[in-house]
């Protein structure tokens, strides 16, 4: 039977909903709401899941939020902020969504899909 | 539109075989983890077993392990359940069911079912 | 192994509130989903992350989970919503689905 199915496709999912939101966006994403800038190093997956969980009542990000869960071990709630390591800068949604995606295709282009 | 249709159930005599097939269409099946649910006729929901979009990983029910194997075909957009030493207890509706993304896919949601199969294991 | 134990049945009036509740061993640690299944028909999710809808659910659903005990709260009541509700969670490699409770609209 076929072999594993390697993990780029799972990244690719999620940096192509990032490429859908971002060429999408008309009025500012989810009213122009902040969140904690993150290091996108280690970790970079639960942290930004954290960050954004604490959005509400945004529907272009919901299946953001819900696809950075299928990355992160454990579950993530509002508010907690485990992951997040130091929270001293907030940047607007449709900038935190920006970085994330450089960052995402960055690793993509290098083959680091874990 | 996301879409997943099961064949293959059937009547089959207590200790035999059955193959089923889940053809999946409108999303990119080989990102997505698939998973097998059963219910047996006036009972609940019961997980059968998971196949991981990510890596490859199989994932069981105790009350199936050692007998059911879960595999995938991704050129084909398929996804099987090999059933073999089947009891009486196995009769149900098995159902295909769209999983999560990544490597922990569970904490996604089961958000695609198809309308299911019946099985049916009676002498 | 790991259980979720739901009330068998539930009865609501129309227009009132129907409360379902899912019971496992620091539930609130996992994430819980919700899926409701009318008679010959396959299950649909209603409720993820504990709490999330997705798109097409009605607002009238809405689900919370902390402690041992996920609840699933249907408000204003219809006729339609009337079918077995069943939570599940994800615990040592395995999907758990709760026993399913059978929420009956009166009237």
């Known amino acids: 039977s076929p072999g594993p199915v390697p993990p780029s496709t799972a990244l690719r999912e999620l940096i192509e909903e990032l490429v859908n939101i971002t060429q999408n966006q008309k009025a500012p994403l989810c009213n122009g709401s902040m969140v904690w800038s993150i290091n996108l190093t280690a970790g970079m997956y639960c942290a930004a899941l954290e960050s954004l969980i604490n959005v509400s009542g945004c529907s272009a990000i919901e299946k953001t939020q819900r696809m950075l869960s299928g990355f992160c071990p454990h579950k993530v709630s509002a508010g907690q902020f485990s992951s997040l390591h130091v929270r001293d800068t907030k940047i607007e949604v449709a900038q935190f969504v920006k970085d994330l995606l450089l960052h995402l295709k960055k690793l993509f282009r290098e083959g680091r899909f874990n | 539109e996301v879409q997943l249709l099961e064949s293959g159930g059937g009547l089959v005599q207590p200790g035999g075989s059955l193959r089923l097939s889940c053809a999946a269409s409108g999303f990119t099946f080989s990102s997505y983890a698939m998973s097998w649910v059963r219910q047996a006729p006036g009972k609940g929901l019961e997980w059968v077993s998971a196949?991981?979009?990510?890596?490859?990983?199989?994932y069981y029910a105790d009350s199936v392990k050692g007998r059911f194997t879960i595999s995938r075909d991704n050129s084909k957009n398929t996804l099987y359940l090999q059933m073999n030493s089947l009891r009486a207890e196995d009769t149900a509706v098995y159902y295909c069911?769209?999983?999560?993304?990544?490597?922990?896919?569970?904490?996604?949601?089961?958000?695609?079912w198809g309308q299911g199969t019946t099985v049916t294991v009676s002498s | 192994s790991y259980e979720l134990t739901q009330p068998p049945s539930v009865s609501v009036s129309p227009g009132q509130t129907a409360s379902i509740t899912c019971s496992g061993d620091?539930?609130?640690?996992?994430?819980t989903c919700w899926f409701q299944q009318k008679p010959g028909q396959s299950p649909v999710l209603v409720i993820y992350?504990?709490?999330k809808r997705p798109s097409g659910i009605p607002e009238r659903f809405s689900g919370s989970n902390s402690g041992d005990t996920a609840t699933l709260t249907i408000s204003g009541t219809q006729a339609m919503d009337e079918a077995d509700y069943y939570c599940q969670a994800w615990d040592s490699s395995t999907y758990v689905f709760g026993t399913g409770t059978k929420v009956t609209v009166l009237g």
């Open positions: 196949f991981s979009g990510s890596g490859g990983s199989t």
């Open positions: 620091k539930l609130g640690d996992k994430y």
């Open positions: 069911v769209q999983d999560g993304l990544g490597p922990y896919f569970y904490n996604y949601g089961m958000d695609v």
């Open positions: 992350h504990d709490s």
